[in-house]
Interface confidence: medium
C-alpha cells in the first residue's frame, strides 16, 4: 500500500492511473467504503463523505487516464486509507496528516523558549527533526522545546517529519523581538551633541508598547529615569523627560536619543528597556557613554575620560607629530609646563583611536616690566 | 492518417444561431476527446468546449456554457458546435482539435470563420 | 484560471537561437509531468503542435525547436533560426480547467 504524507491546512492529491490512456469510470471511496468521488462521463460526482466539500479531481486529466483524489484543507482526522476502483483494479493509498505549530506566538521575546508541538494520526509513531535558522539541530517526538532563544534564532525553522520511511517538511517562521546590539558604547568630547540609537531586530506591521530610558552616572550614587515614552503602530511620543539632561527623541523607528552635549556629569551607562503590548517581558539594550575633556591650567596640560572604560584603554598625551609624552592605562594624564604646539589627547584601545581632543597650547612670553 | 474537416461558418446577425460541424477519419471516434477552440481576429486562442466521445458528456467554459451546446452524429462521426444567441464579440476562426500523446492538441480542423454583424 | 504570460514579440537574424518565455500563474505540474505545449501559428492556418509536456518533440517537428521548464516558467527556444519560422507562437496549460493559452509571442526573422 502506498503511503502519503500530508501536512494539515495544505492540500493533497492522491493519484490513481489506469492503463487505459482514456476517460472511464473511477470511484475513490475510503476504509469504510463511502464514496468520496466518481465520474459520470465527464461529470464529477461526489459521494456522502465528509470530505465532500473539500474532495475534487482533475477532469482535464481524466481522458490521460489519470483519476486524481484532491483533499484540501487537510484535517489530522482525514487520515485514512483511500481506495481508488478504476478497471476492476483497487487502489489503496495511505494518507497521514500531520500538523506542526508553536504552542505560543511566533513572535517570541530574547531568551524566551520556543515549544513545537506535532499534530499526528493515531496509531503513527513519527519522528521529528527541526533545524534553526543558525543551524542548530533538535530532535523529538510529539514535543520540542528550545530554552533561551537568541537572536540569531529568528528566522525560518525548517521541520521534517519522518514517518513509514517518508517525509513531510514544515516551515515555521520566528520572530525573536530583540533589539539588533546588546550593548553599545558612544566616545564623545565634552561639548559634543551624542545621539544614541536603539535599532531592532524585527519588523512587525504594527508595533505598540512603552519604554524607558533609566541612567546610571558614574559620579552619581543611584540611576535616574532620564526619559519615558509610548509607541504606537511605530509613532513614538514622549511621556515624560528630564529637565537636566534635556534628551529629545526621534519621531519615529528606529529609537532615537540626543543628548544635547557631552559632559563629564552625564558618563555612564544607561538601560534602555522597552515593553511590547501582550508580551511578557521586556526587550532590553545597555548604552555607554565615555566623555573625554583637555584642559590647560596654568603650567598643567590635563588629559581626562569620565564613563565606563575597560582597564586595557589606554590614555595619552602627545605633540602633534611626536612621539607621547605620556601613556597610562588610567582615567586622567598630565603635562606640566607643555611645549607649545597642537596637543592631542588620544584614547585608545590596542592603536586604534576611539577618541580625540586637540588642545592648542601657547607660548609663554615673559612680560616687560612697564617703565 | 487523421483527419478533422470543419464546415459551418458564416455570417450572421447578433442574437440568431448557427451549427459548426466537424467531421472525423483515421482514428476511433469514441476513444478521444475533442475539443473546441476559438480566436477571435487579430487575438489569441482560447478554449471553448470538449466532448467526451464516448459518453457523449461535455464540459464547456463557463463563458459559453449558456449559449453554445456540442451534439454529435455516430454514425457519421461529426462533431456539432451549436452557437445561439450570437454576439459581436463571438466573431472569429472557431477550431476543433484532437489530443495527440500527451495532453496537447495535435491535430486541428482548417478552421471555420463565423461573423458576426 | 491560471494564465499564461508570454512577451509580445521576439526576433533574431537567420541562424541565431531565439528564446521565447511562457509564466504560468500557478503550477502546471502533476504526478512527475509537466501540462504544458506550444504552437506555432501561420497567418491563416490552424496551429500546430511543436512541443508537448514541456519538453517533448512532437513528431514530424524539426529537432531545432525544443521545450524546457524551470518552476512556473516554460521555454521555446529556436536554434538556427529559418525564415520559415516566421510566426505567431503560443503556450498552452492542460493541467487544469479550463485549459488556457498564453497571451502569443510573434517572432520575426531579421
Known amino acids: 500500500k502506498k503511503v502519503v504524507l500530508g501536512k494539515k491546512g495544505d492540500t493533497v492529491e492522491l493519484t490513481c492511473t489506469a492503463s487505459q490512456k482514456k476517460s472511464i469510470q473511477f470511484h475513490w471511496k475510503n476504509s469504510n467504503q463511502i464514496k468520496i468521488l466518481g465520474n459520470q462521463g465527464s461529470f464529477l460526482t461526489k459521494g456522502p463523505s465528509k470530505l465532500n466539500d473539500r474532495a475534487d479531481s482533475r477532469r482535464s486529466l481524466w481522458d490521460q487516464g489519470n483519476f486524481p483524489l484532491i483533499i484540501k484543507n487537510l484535517k489530522i482526522e482525514d487520515s485514512d486509507t483511500y481506495i481508488c476502483e478504476v478497471e476492476d483494479q483497487k487502489e489503496e493509498v495511505q494518507l497521514l496528516v500531520f500538523g506542526l505549530t508553536a504552542n505560543s506566538d511566533t513572535h517570541l521575546l530574547q531568551g524566551q523558549s520556543l515549544t513545537l508541538t506535532l499534530e499526528s494520526p493515531p496509531g503513527s509513531s513519527p519522528s521529528v527533526q527541526c533545524r534553526s535558522p543558525r543551524g542548530k539541530n533538535i530532535q523529538g517526538g510529539k514535543t520540542l522545546s528550545v530554552s533561551q532563544l537568541e537572536l540569531q534564532d529568528s528566522g525560518t525553522w525548517t521541520c521534517t517529519v519522518l514517518q513509514n520511511q517518508k517525509k513531510v517538511e514544515f516551515k515555521i517562521d520566528i520572530v525573536v523581538l530583540a533589539f539588533q546590539k546588546a550593548s553599545s558604547i558612544v566616545y564623545k568630547k565634552e561639548g559634543e551633541q551624542v545621539e544614541f540609537s536603539f535599532p531592532l531586530a524585527f519588523t512587525v506591521e504594527k508595533l505598540t508598547g512603552s519604554g524607558e530610558l533609566w541612567w546610571q552616572a558614574e559620579r552619581a550614587s543611584s540611576s535616574k529615569s532620564w526619559i519615558t515614552f509610548d509607541l504606537k503602530n511605530k509613532e513614538v511620543s514622549v511621556k515624560r523627560v528630564t529637565q537636566d539632561p534635556k534628551l529629545q527623541m526621534g519621531k519615529k523607528l528606529p529609537l532615537h536619543l540626543t543628548l544635547p552635549q557631552a559632559l563629564p556629569q552625564y558618563a555612564g551607562s544607561g538601560n534602555l528597556t522597552l515593553a511590547l503590548e501582550a508580551k511578557t517581558g521586556k526587550l532590553h539594550q545597555e548604552v555607554n557613554l565615555v566623555v573625554m575633556r583637555a584642559t590647560q591650567l596654568q603650567k598643567n596640560l590635563t588629559c581626562e575620560v569620565w564613563g565606563p572604560t575597560s582597564p586595557k584603554l589606554m590614555l595619552s598625551l602627545k605633540l602633534e607629530n611626536k612621539e607621547a609624552k605620556v601613556s597610562k592605562r588610567e582615567k586622567a594624564v598630565w603635562v606640566l609646563n607643555p611645549e607649545a604646539g597642537m596637543w592631542q589627547c588620544l584614547l585608545s584601545d590596542s592603536g586604534q583611536v576611539l577618541l580625540e581632543s586637540n588642545i592648542k597650547v601657547l607660548p609663554t612670553w615673559s612680560t616687560p616690566v612697564q617703565p | 492518417e487523421v483527419q478533422l474537416v470543419q464546415s459551418g461558418g458564416g455570417v450572421v446577425q447578433p442574437g440568431r444561431s448557427l451549427r459548426l460541424s466537424c467531421s472525423s477519419s483515421g482514428f476511433i471516434f469514441s476513444d478521444y476527446v475533442i475539443n473546441w477552440v476559438r480566436q477571435a481576429p487579430g487575438k489569441g486562442l482560447e478554449w471553448v468546449a470538449e466532448?467526451?466521445?464516448?459518453?457523449?458528456?461535455?464540459y464547456y467554459n463557463e463563458k459559453f456554457k449558456d449559449r453554445f451546446t456540442i451534439s454529435r452524429n455516430d454514425s457519421k462521426n461529426t462533431l456539432f458546435l451549436q452557437m445561439d444567441s450570437l454576439r459581436p464579440e463571438d466573431t472569429g476562426v472557431y477550431f476543433c482539435?484532437?489530443?495527440?500523446?500527451?495532453?496537447?492538441?495535435?491535430?486541428w480542423g482548417q478552421g471555420t470563420p463565423v461573423t458576426v454583424s | 484560471e491560471s494564465v499564461l504570460t508570454q512577451p509580445p514579440s521576439a526576433s533574431g537574424t537567420p541562424g541565431q537561437r531565439v528564446t521565447i518565455s511562457c509564466k504560468a500563474s500557478?503550477?502546471?505540474?502533476?504526478?512527475?509531468?509537466?501540462?504544458m505545449n506550444w504552437y506555432q501559428q501561420l497567418p491563416g492556418m490552424a496551429p500546430k503542435l511543436l512541443i508537448y509536456a514541456a519538453s517533448n518533440l512532437e513528431s514530424g517537428v524539426p529537432t531545432r525547436f525544443s521545450g524546457s521548464k524551470s518552476g512556473t516558467s516554460a521555454s521555446l527556444a529556436i536554434s538556427g533560426l529559418e525564415a520559415e519560422d516566421e510566426s505567431d507562437y503560443y503556450c498552452q496549460q492542460s493541467y487544469e480547467d479550463p485549459p488556457t493559452f498564453g497571451t502569443g509571442t510573434k517572432v520575426t526573422v531579421l
Open positions: 482539435a484532437r489530443r495527440g500523446k500527451g495532453t496537447g492538441f495535435a491535430f
Open positions: 500557478q503550477s502546471v505540474d502533476y504526478d512527475g509531468d509537466s501540462y
Open positions: 466532448t467526451y466521445t464516448g459518453s457523449g458528456s461535455s
